[in-house]
């Protein structure tokens, strides 16, 4: 008799999830000498232990603590780039400006990027059919709780000037309900962080508006200022040109020397 299984509204666990996590861990630790001490099998066991046999709507940050401990990593706290709704460009940027780090440039972020996972209560099976959707089912699901946990820790580690890349093409350039708006903004430490610098990325070629004057950016400025952190905002009108200039700063059309 086929066992009844809860049908969730979201996509199921990414196929070959265990193999993918393990392979990513091995690759990351090979090219990052400061993480060579990490035992990837232990990392996978801790990852698995966070959600296997647990109800996928009942996951807590505590469940991820063994994984957090194994994945502890020091990144230069003054080189952190947060992002909201513009992940691809943020990652392209840290590929050409390698001294800056997004969460997905850290081991734990790299392991989980673009993956979905969940288990089932009281069985050791991984659910490849469906997983809870944050809105339609529950917020305390394995994926959401993981990103909330690692995002909080990442923001807490930041210091000096913290940068955030925001998508200027969206109706809400700053969205209070995004991971950045709901988790990271509130976990920056005012005693360590001097300034949050927002980079608003323009979408249209002819868009010359100052999106730093957008009401949602003003809302972000207000939230940050109330936390005793300075705020600055810059428009990046041509993201393609920006990336090219970051890569080749001596190009005559790019340079402004300091």
């Amino acid at each position: 008799v086929p066992r009844w299984r809860q049908q969730w509204s979201g996509p199921g666990t990414t196929k070959r999830f265990p193999e993918t996590v393990l392979a990513r861990c091995v690759k990351y630790t090979e090219i990052h000498p400061e993480m060579r001490h990490v035992d990837c099998q232990s990392v996978w066991d801790a990852f698995k232990g966070a959600f296997i046999s647990k109800h996928p709507c009942n996951i807590t940050e505590e469940d991820y603590q063994p994984l957090m401990k194994l994945g502890t990593q020091t990144v230069p706290c003054n080189k952190i780039l947060l992002w909201s709704r513009i992940k691809d460009l943020a990652h392209q940027f840290t590929q050409v400006q390698r001294d800056m780090f997004t969460l997905e440039d850290t081991l734990l972020g790299y392991l989980a990027d673009d993956l979905t996972w969940c288990g089932e209560f009281n069985t050791s099976k991984i659910n490849y059919q469906s997983c809870p959707d944050w809105r339609k089912d529950c917020s305390n699901n394995p994926v959401s709780v993981f990103w909330k946990t690692v995002s909080r820790r990442f923001a807490e580690a930041a210091c000096d000037v913290v940068h955030v890349m925001l998508n200027g093409s969206r109706s809400k350039i700053f969205d209070k309900n995004s991971t950045f708006g709901s988790v990271e903004v509130h976990n920056l430490q005012p005693e360590k962080v001097q300034t949050l610098e927002a980079w608003v990325i323009h979408g249209g070629r002819e868009d010359s508006r100052d999106l730093c004057q957008d009401p949602t950016i003003k809302e972000l400025e207000s939230i940050i200022s109330k936390r005793n952190i300075q705020f600055s905002c810059k428009n990046i009108y041509r993201p393609d040109k920006f990336l090219q200039c970051v890569k080749n700063p001596e190009d005559s059309s790019c340079t402004s020397e300091i």
């Epitope: 090219i31 990052h32 000498p33 400061e34 020091t74 230069p76 080189k79 400006q97 390698r98 001294d99 000096d160 980079w199 810059k234 428009n235 990046i236 009108y237 041509r238 040109k241 920006f242 200039c245 970051v246 700063p249 790019c254 340079t255 402004s256 020397e257 300091i258």
Partner: antibody, heavy 127, light 108 residues
Framework: EVQLLESGGGLVQPGGSLRLSCTGF????????MSWVRQAPGKGLEWVAD????????YYADSVKGRFTISRDNSANTLYVQMNSLRAEDTAVYYC????????????????????WGQGTTVTVSS | QSVLTQTPSVSGTPGQRVTISCSGV??????VSWYQQLPGTAPKLLIF???QRPSGVPDRFSGSRSGTSASLAISGLQSEDEADYYC???????????FGGGTKLTVL
């Protein structure tokens, strides 16, 4: 023309002190991260210390930690290194250097290189 | 603390291409820069960010990077290229500069 001029070198006895200065011209000194690098006679380059643009972050080589202090006076466009408890092995030509940074579409980025160097000033520690 | 290792000396004849290597770059996120020091003068930046040339540096000089090693190539060797060449990297994790021991280039 972008230029750095060091001064303050000389002969000093072991255990003595010396302060080197480096004045910047032709660039916005306030925005520049600065370094001291030294070269012992017939030897290679050795980094000594680094300071952020506003002086709030300083970094030192293990060989000088606790004895040397890097500082800056942005109003005078001048970088300093105060050298105490000097030893014979501190004998070298001392160069100041500007850290390479660029503003790319108003975003300030660090390019992890020293793009302007002074002519050097010689420090001799001997009795 | 990491150490960058350079071949102590290389030589070549005018017009030739020579390569100077630098191994032991401790992290893929650390950039390598190269400096030329002519006899009796201060060092001069030749290459930054692994392979980028500052304006004013001839395109005969080129940098490359592969994992933990970097190299500086000089093509069309000229007598005025006779100098000491140093690789360096800022360790973004330890906040220290590390220099290679230098390579003496002799133009025969």
């Amino acid at each position: 023309e972008v230029q750095l001029l060091e001064s303050g070198g000389g002969l000093v006895q072991p255990g003595g002190s010396l302060r080197l200065s480096c004045t910047g011209f032709g660039f916005t000194f306030t925005d520049a991260r600065m370094s001291w690098v030294r070269q012992a006679p017939g030897k290679g380059l050795e980094w000594v210390a680094d300071i952020s643009s506003y002086g709030d972050n300083t970094y030192y080589a293990d060989s000088v930690k606790g004895r040397f202090t890097i500082s800056r006076d942005n109003s005078a466009n001048t970088l300093y290194v105060q050298m105490n408890s000097l030893r014979a092995e501190d004998t070298a030509v001392y160069y100041c250097a500007k850290r390479m940074e660029r503003e790319v579409m108003t975003i300030k980025l660090d390019y992890h290189a020293m793009d302007v160097w002074g002519q050097g000033t010689t420090v001799t520690v001997s009795s | 603390q990491s150490v960058l290792t350079q071949t102590p000396s290389v030589s070549g004849t005018p017009g030739q291409r020579v390569t100077i290597s630098c191994s032991g770059v401790f992290n893929i996120r650390n950039y390598v820069s190269w400096y030329q020091q002519l006899p009796g003068t201060a060092p001069k930046l030749l290459i930054f960010k692994d392979d980028q040339r500052p304006s004013g540096v001839p395109d005969r000089f080129s940098g490359s990077r592969s994992g933990t090693s970097a190299s500086l190539a000089i093509s069309g060797l000229q007598s005025e290229d006779e100098a000491d060449y140093y690789c360096a990297a800022w360790d973004i994790f330890l906040n220290v500069w590390v220099f290679g021991g230098g390579t003496k280039l002799t133009v025969l």
